[in-house]
Interface confidence: low
């Protein structure tokens, strides 16, 4: 079955960077876009961006442009999200989630378990 | 960015009774060729969001048929025909028509 397994929780200082990994299994990794979404305490879910593993094409939420980098390692079926210049408001649970076309419909279907990133001095 | 507004934000329900959640977008979510990328997710306590409905009204496989989606343009609704105890959690709508994709603020469904 489709599974997305993320790396463990991270505690970072303001100004530092964090890199979260997401390993996909149970499906053809290169056939589906990988999305990244975060959820800060008491906030709505927020879409960060997406990457096409087959060609490494990316689309980013402008809010994160310049601070976030999405990459993949196809050989390891793993996607990465790196967020730099961290600030306290980046404290959130970060999710990877698979997206794909089903016939003519598109949806983000399966989600990772989430990675808590805490930014604190 | 497209703003997604859900209502109500809190929904106390009685098991066996119907429930309805509304989601309104600040602009039309219909693509030029007719598709509308509007989906609904349920996030149960301590879990990741799970897909319920995609393309406005298509139930994701394994989702009970008590869940249904409807709407068009800017107004969308998720209905639960008979709420069960396992349905509690926070429900989110998501638009995937315009980038950046945006979520509603969530509707917390809890048993009365």
């Amino acid at each position: 079955q489709v599974q997305l397994v993320q790396s463990g929780a991270e505690v970072k200082k303001p100004g530092a960077s964090v890199k979260v990994s997401c390993k996909g299994s149970g499906y053809t990794f290169t056939s589906y876009w990988m999305h990244w979404v975060r959820q800060a305490p008491g906030q709505r879910l927020e879409w960060i961006g997406e990457i096409d593993p087959s060609e490494s094409n990316t689309n980013y939420n402008q809010k994160f442009k310049g601070r976030v980098t999405l990459t993949v390692d196809i050989s390891a079926s793993t996607a990465y999200m790196e967020l730099s210049s961290l600030r306290s408001e980046d404290t959130a649970v970060y999710y990877c989630a698979r997206g794909g076309y089903d016939g003519w419909d598109y949806a983000i279907d399966y989600w990772g378990q989430g990675t808590l990133v805490t930014v604190s001095s | 960015d497209v703003v997604m507004t859900q209502s109500p934000l809190s929904l106390p329900v009685t098991p066996g009774e119907p429930a309805s959640i509304s989601c309104r977008s600040s602009q039309s979510l219909a693509k030029s060729y007719g598709n509308t990328y509007l989906s609904w997710y349920l996030q149960k306590p301590g879990q990741s969001p799970q897909l319920l409905i995609y393309g406005i009204s298509n139930r994701f496989s394994g989702v009970p048929d008590r869940f249904s989606g409807s709407g068009s343009g800017t107004d969308f609704t998720l209905k639960i025909s008979r709420v069960e105890a396992e349905d509690v959690g926070v429900y989110y709508c998501l638009q995937g028509t315009h980038q950046p994709y945006t979520f509603g603020q969530g509707t917390k469904v809890e048993i009365k």
Epitope: S31, G100, Y101, D102, G103, D105, A107, D109 | S61
Partner: antibody
Framework: EVKLVESGGGLVQPGGSLKLSCAAS????????MAWVRQAPRKGPEWVGF????????YYADTVTGRFTISRENAKNTLYLEMSSLRSEDTAMYYC??????????????WGQGTSVTVSS | DVQITQSPSYLAASPGETITINCRAS??????LAWYQEKPGKTNKLLIY???TLQSGIPSRFSGSGSGTDFTLTISSLEPEDFAMYYC?????????FGSGTKLEMK
Amino acid sequence: EVKLVESGGGLVQPGGSLKLSCAASGFTFSDYGMAWVRQAPRKGPEWVGFISNLAYSIYYADTVTGRFTISRENAKNTLYLEMSSLRSEDTAMYYCAREDGTTGESAMDYWGQGTSVTVSS
Amino acid sequence: DVQITQSPSYLAASPGETITINCRASKSISKYLAWYQEKPGKTNKLLIYSGSTLQSGIPSRFSGSGSGTDFTLTISSLEPEDFAMYYCQQHYEYPYTFGSGTKLEMK
């Protein structure tokens, strides 16, 4: 070239179970919806059910609803039909077929050679 | 369910002739009707979909027409390899349903 090869058919008693497989090759399996169609001796074909490319949507004929389960493993390029509570009227040749939905006008464009299922005591 | 009535159930013709097979749906299915050819020992072959669209690789002597409830498959200048079983199928809504078949035999 597109190839669909069914397997798993055989003789089973009424009330018994059987799992059919369909191995696909020659195309990107995860891009296509797949269907099962059966044909009883001296009868026309009967559509059994359909599973969309990412398995978001699964549909069944009324005659098999609750007894048959369609699934797919895109990572293995394989389609399945799990049949339980089998009846004599389920005796048929079972075909898997690719549904070409790329035009938005779906038709079953490639079929397998079929696998025979006989339900008899 | 949409009922599909196919006629005739049997047809004898000679190579070079033109034949037609008809299918009628119990309600409007727009243009969404497909035609298949079935031969012993071979996999079913899609000939026509969406009423009149020729599947790639299918000879142009095969043509489809019709919309709504009434559809026709025409094979002009029959070739020896065209003698086979033909089925129509609606792909307008689930459950997909088939006609009962037309057996085309050589005179």
